[in-house]
């Protein structure tokens, strides 16, 4: 999906009002020095691409993020503020339902959510002349 035509300000508002707090809740009890952010993004569409990938694509050691509250709210924000996003996600959602497993918060998941916080920071404030 091409995130170029999303309403970035509305997504930012959704992040700051609820998603950010859910990410903090998920990370509660984790030391702030524990993880280095290794995933970066250069502009807002790129940040959303990386955010989508880390939030919804299962990775080795962390298969369950898509069922977390922050992920569901992220999905809702993208569906509302990115034209045509919902349609592109129907097949992915059906595939995910077949893979459904119980929720386990692993260290790998905590690291992944730390990366997500970093990506959202860059989405909120990209280091570009034109934001």
């Amino acid at each position: 999906y091409d995130f170029t035509n999303c309403d970035f300000e509305k997504i930012k508002a959704a992040y700051l009002s609820t998603i950010s707090k859910d990410l903090i809740t998920y990370m509660s009890g984790t030391k702030s020095t524990e993880f280095n952010n290794t995933v970066s993004c250069s502009n807002r569409p790129h940040c959303l691409t990386e955010i989508q990938s880390l939030t919804f694509n299962p990775t080795a050691g962390c298969a369950s993020l898509a069922k977390e509250m922050f992920a569901m709210k992220t999905k809702a924000a993208l569906a509302i503020w990115c034209p045509g996003y919902s349609e592109t996600q129907i097949n992915a959602t059906q595939a995910m339902k077949k893979r459904r497993k119980r929720k386990v918060t692993t260290n790998k998941c905590l690291e992944q959510v730390s990366q997500l916080q970093g990506l959202w920071r860059r989405f909120n404030r990209p280091l570009l002349k034109q934001q």
Epitope: E9, A13, Y15, L16, S20, I24, S32, T33, E34, F35, N36, N37, S40, S114, Q117, G118, W120, R121, R122, F123, N124, R125, L127, L128, K129, Q131
Partner: antibody, heavy 119, light 107 residues
Amino acid sequence: EVQLVQSGAEVKKPGSSVKVSCKASGGTFSNYLIEWVRQAPGQGLEWMGVIDPGQGDTNYNENFKGRVTITADKSTSTAYMELSSLRSEDTAVYYCAREDNTGTAFDYWGQGTTVTVSS
Amino acid sequence: DIVMTQSPDSLAVSLGERATINCKASQSVSSDVTWYQQKPGQSPKLLIYYVSNHYTGVPDRFSGSGSGTDFTLTISSLQAEDVAVYYCQQHHRFPLTFGQGTKLEIK
């Protein structure tokens, strides 16, 4: 607890350069932007520029006409701000600050470094 | 550059009374406004981010509102420790810019 500790006060001659350091502790240095802000005596706050220590990306206030250079050393968790071609109007307290967890504000500030430019 | 203009430049309010500081942007900054408090001889402290969100530990007598070009910081019941200079800041466009500051004193 995150702390930003800046280098000591400096007295400089007009035309010279100054390099102020900002050492971070208590957080992951490379994960957060470091900003530089200055405050002339009795005046308000002026944003100078920002660095992403993880990527090395920077953005500067063009009002400084290329006189500002911001760098970061990940190995020592230290950011630096160098200001060249100093003039008397550059006399100010220089602050480093770290972005907050949302990327929308500066939540931790250094104690400030006084730079005096005088002949 | 986006110019942030605060009003008034200084303000004297009685203890327990409401203090209101305004900030006007020269063009729309959406909701990308932050408020800082600076006491004499100290570094600035973050109060409110993204117009109306309290930073951790900030008393709820502080509140922020507005959008677009007009923003307000309100202290609902002034306390002695609130004497300081208050700055608004926009982070919607580079370069980031601050208001000139509003000095708040006790009447």
